[in-house]
């Protein structure tokens, strides 16, 4: 039995006609099975295959090879969270966080908790002590005075 165009199988009871539109992107093999065009997958070949490495959790695509990030995520693979706007010395594990690096504090991680180490403000052999975010105190050796032992 010879089947009409686009019909396949025993009894010609399978239909497959190549298409490349909203409903699917496929060709047909000799048995009438849909074979997805490059970059497409799914039962109807209407699901794009995203860029290799694109985060399945935070990225998606409507066109093959693309990787569009969900709100709050960034990067080529949508695997990097976007920190809180204005976050200076901090990172995030989830979007909009600002987790401070060592020796930094405050909501935007812009307060220096180790002012002594970062700025070494005490002169003339003075001993520096961190007293709070962006605050320090110098203990001056005999013969020196002033906030930074500069006198």
């Amino acid at each position: 039995v010879t089947c009409d165009d686009y019909y396949y199988g025993f009894g010609c009871n399978k239909f497959c006609r190549p298409r490349d539109d909203f409903f699917g992107h496929y060709a047909c093999d000799q048995n009438g099975n849909k074979t997805c065009m490059e970059g497409w997958m799914g039962p109807e070949c209407n699901r794009a295959i995203c860029r290799q490495g694109c985060s399945p959790k935070h990225g998606s695509c409507k066109l093959p090879g693309d990787c569009r990030c969900q709100y709050g995520w960034q990067g080529l693979y949508c695997d990097k969270c976007i920190p809180h706007p204005g976050c200076v010395h901090g990172i995030c594990n989830e979007p909009w966080q600002c987790l401070c690096e060592t020796n930094w504090g405050g909501q935007l991680c812009d307060k220096d908790l180790n002012y002594c180490g970062t700025h070494q403000p005490c002169l003339n052999g003075g001993t520096c002590s961190n007293t709070g975010p962006d605050k320090y105190q110098c203990s001056c050796p005999e013969g020196y005075s002033g906030p930074n032992c500069e006198i």
Partner: antibody
Framework: QVQLVQSGAELKKPGASVKVSCKVS????????IHWIRQAPGQGLEWMGI????????KYAQKFQGRVTMTVDTSTSTAYMELSSLRSEDTAVYYC?????????WGQGTLVTVSS | DIQMTQSPSSLSASVGDRVTITCRTS??????LTWYQQKPGKAPKLLIY???ILDSGVPSRFSGSGSGTDFTLTISSLQPEDFATYYC?????????FGGGTKLEIK
């Protein structure tokens, strides 16, 4: 087995909106598109639109453009059809259906009555 | 939009008769045509898809033919449960329009 279960009957006033749900079970929800079809009393079938359940993209018949919104909630395997600015001519049974090569599976239908 | 012209709009026949319903489209839809049966108060039931493929569980007395713009649904020997309304629909491109329906009544 595949099932599409729709929300109950609605009575609406002209100018209002209605939102009909279609909860799916028995297959992977995002594998198949959902279509919406309506049938006015004593009339034929009218195709309203289709939604790609994976992406949430929809295409509507010109007649309903601007008045209909089709959405999906993949977490609950539910499709929704909202029709706004209702008028008496929108009184109909609204069906959801699954398929690409015709509709092998249909919801039971939701009667929407628009009356003042 | 593709227009679907279904004929006849109504038809009286007897049990055992051979019945033919036709559907003509305004442009070539290849074989993207479906036939449905609907009984009062029920959702339509898929009979035939892609013009001639019988859906599973549909009796073999139903058959479909045609391609391009002219399609036919044939019931070879009418049974009492076949009295219903029949619709054709294309699924070639958006919008997927339906024919106007054919009401099949007992003579």
């Amino acid at each position: 087995q595949v099932q599409l279960v729709q929300s109950g009957a609605e009575l609406k006033k002209p100018g209002a909106s209605v939102k009909v749900s279609c909860k799916v079970s028995g297959y992977a929800f995002t594998d198949y598109a959902i279509h919406w079809i309506r049938q006015a009393p004593g009339q034929g079938l009218e195709w309203m639109g289709i939604i790609n359940t994976y992406y949430g993209d929809s295409k509507y018949a010109q007649k309903f453009q601007g008045r209909v919104t089709m959405t999906v909630d993949t977490s609950t395997s539910t499709a929704y059809m909202e029709l706004s600015s209702l008028r008496s001519e929108d009184t109909a049974v609204y069906y959801c259906a699954r398929g690409y090569d015709g509709f092998a599976y249909w919801g039971q239908g939701t009667l929407v009555t628009v009356s003042s | 939009d593709i227009q679907m012209t279904q004929s006849p709009s109504s038809l009286s026949a007897s049990v055992g008769d051979r019945v033919t319903i036709t559907c003509r489209t305004s442009e070539n839809i290849y074989s993207y045509l479906t036939w449905y049966q609907q009984k009062p108060g029920k959702a339509p039931k898929l009979l035939i898809y892609n013009a001639k493929i019988l859906d599973s569980g549909v009796p073999s007395r139903f058959s479909g033919s045609g391609s391009g713009t002219d399609f036919t649904l044939t019931i070879s020997s009418l049974q009492p449960e076949d009295f219903a309304t029949y619709y054709c629909q294309h699924h070639y491109d958006i919008p997927w329009t339906f024919g106007g329906g054919t009401k099949l009544e007992i003579k």
